[in-house]
């Protein structure tokens, strides 16, 4: 007897987080002699038997959760873990700052604060080099995001989106980026 | 306009078999999943397998599997339902159904039904 | 035994409005599946009612509208008519083994 089929990887290339306009390619990975791919866009009943699919130019209604699967005989894979496709640049860009401000001694707290004119309740700060928000893997949706004794891993330049918890995959324009030195 | 015609029900003998067609016309047949939907006399709808645009995804309900193969001719506009070795519960009405597509995608619903054939297993 | 659960029957006096509910699990409509709603008139095949749990094919009065909400939806129908006596089926996806899933029906009585 066999054992379960693993389940494919999904990734989004070059990012996740894509301007709107911009190019980007979703590609579902199984394992080697895998040709029969179901790829999924949770919550809106579609579906495509690919296993690539290429986006010419982000739109926003193509932004959302993606999932894929595989069919190895009439056997399914269990699917691949949720991919979320964010467009981003729906809205004005918010701006990020340091306080007390972006030059910080090692061992000392640095708080960088996400600051929209617009009423969203969520926001993401991402490191440049990183491929997930700061934090990983928590998401910290909020305005202030403390960094309690900074290190040198610190260092680097930072960016904030923010968005509505109500349409949590369209995304502001990056803010800024605000460059963090650790002395 | 969209037309889904099946036909090839009738009476038969538990462990016999029957094939059943559905004809379609009024669409690009080779765009569409297809589906067969059955209902037991004063029952609810089951749906039984489905087979993707270029017939090579196929899935069956776990009552089926084993028993029943689906395929399709996108020459011919049409959908088959071999059934082998029936058994008194598949007695129902098997309906033929679209699935709904726009451009690249297929969707998880249907939006065209044919008008059903009776097939009786009984001896 | 269907996979998602509707009451077997509701009824309402002609002018009223009735809901009908349909529940189903984490791997159908709670893995993210939308639910889509069918009428089938006494002696004829089902049709397209409710699609992706709140649209209206072209055609279908806007009496009708649907809803989700983690593992349940419903179908309401406001303004209820003599010729909405029907069966109504709910239907979705489930993610085990990609098959479709139907609820067991439900009938509507319209009352007078």
């Known amino acids: 007897q066999r054992g379960p089929l693993p389940k494919p990887s999904l990734q989004a290339l070059p990012s996740s987080l894509v301007p709107l306009e911009k190019p980007v390619t979703l590609r579902c990975q199984g394992p080697p002699g895998v040709d029969l791919y179901r790829l999924e866009k949770l919550s809106s009943s579609r579906y495509q038997d690919q296993a690539v699919l290429f986006i010419p130019a982000m739109k926003r209604h193509l932004a959302g959760r993606y999932r894929c699967s595989y069919q190895n005989g009439s056997l399914w894979s269990p699917p691949s873990d949720q991919l979320e496709l964010v467009a981003t640049g729906v809205f004005a860009k918010p701006s990020l700052s340091a306080q007390p401000g972006p030059a910080v001694s090692s061992g000392g707290d640095v708080t960088l604060q996400c600051q929209t004119r617009y009423g969203f309740d969520q926001f993401a700060l991402y490191k440049e080099g990183d491929p997930a928000p700061y934090k990983n893997p928590e998401r910290w949706y909020r305005a202030s995001f403390p960094i309690i004794t900074v290190t040198a891993a610190h260092s680097g330049t930072y960016r904030c989106y923010s968005f509505s918890s109500g349409d949590p995959y369209l995304w502001s324009a990056p803010s800024d980026p605000l460059e963090l030195m650790v002395t | 306009q969209v037309q889904l015609v099946e036909s090839g029900g009738g009476l038969v003998k538990p462990g016999g078999s029957l094939r059943l067609s559905c004809a379609a016309s009024?669409?690009?047949?080779?765009?569409?999943?297809m589906s067969w939907i059955r209902q037991a006399p004063g029952k609810g709808l089951e749906w039984v397998s489905s087979?993707?645009?270029?017939?090579?995804?196929?899935d069956y309900a776990a009552s089926v599997k084993g028993r029943f193969t689906i395929s399709r001719d996108n020459a011919k506009n049409s959908l088959y339902l071999q059934m082998n070795s029936l058994r008194a519960e598949d007695t129902a009405v098997y309906y033929c159904?679209?699935?709904?597509?726009?451009?690249?995608?297929?969707?998880?619903?249907?939006?065209?039904w044919g008008q059903g054939t009776l097939v009786t297993v009984s001896s | 035994q269907s996979v998602l659960t509707q009451p077997p029957s509701v009824s309402g006096a002609p002018g009223q409005r009735v809901t009908i509910s349909c529940t189903g699990s984490?791997?159908?409509?709670?893995?993210?599946?939308?639910v889509h709603w069918y009428q089938q008139l006494p002696g004829t095949a089902p049709k397209l009612l409710i699609y992706?749990?709140?649209n209206r094919p072209s055609g279908v009065p806007d009496r009708f509208s649907g809803s989700k909400s983690g593992t349940s939806a419903s179908l309401a129908i406001t303004g209820l008519q003599a010729e909405d006596e029907a069966d109504y089926y709910c239907?979705?996806?489930?993610?085990?083994?990609?098959?479709?899933?139907f609820g067991g029906g439900t009938k509507l009585t319209v009352l007078g």
């Open positions: 159904a679209r699935h709904y597509r726009e451009f690249r995608w297929h969707y998880y619903y249907f939006d065209y």
């Open positions: 984490s791997s159908n409509i709670g893995a993210g599946y939308d």
């Open positions: 009024g669409f690009s047949f080779s765009d569409h999943y």
């Open positions: 087979v993707g645009s270029e017939g090579k995804f196929i």
């Open positions: 992706g749990n709140s």
């Open positions: 239907q979705s996806h489930d993610l085990g083994a990609h098959v479709w899933v």
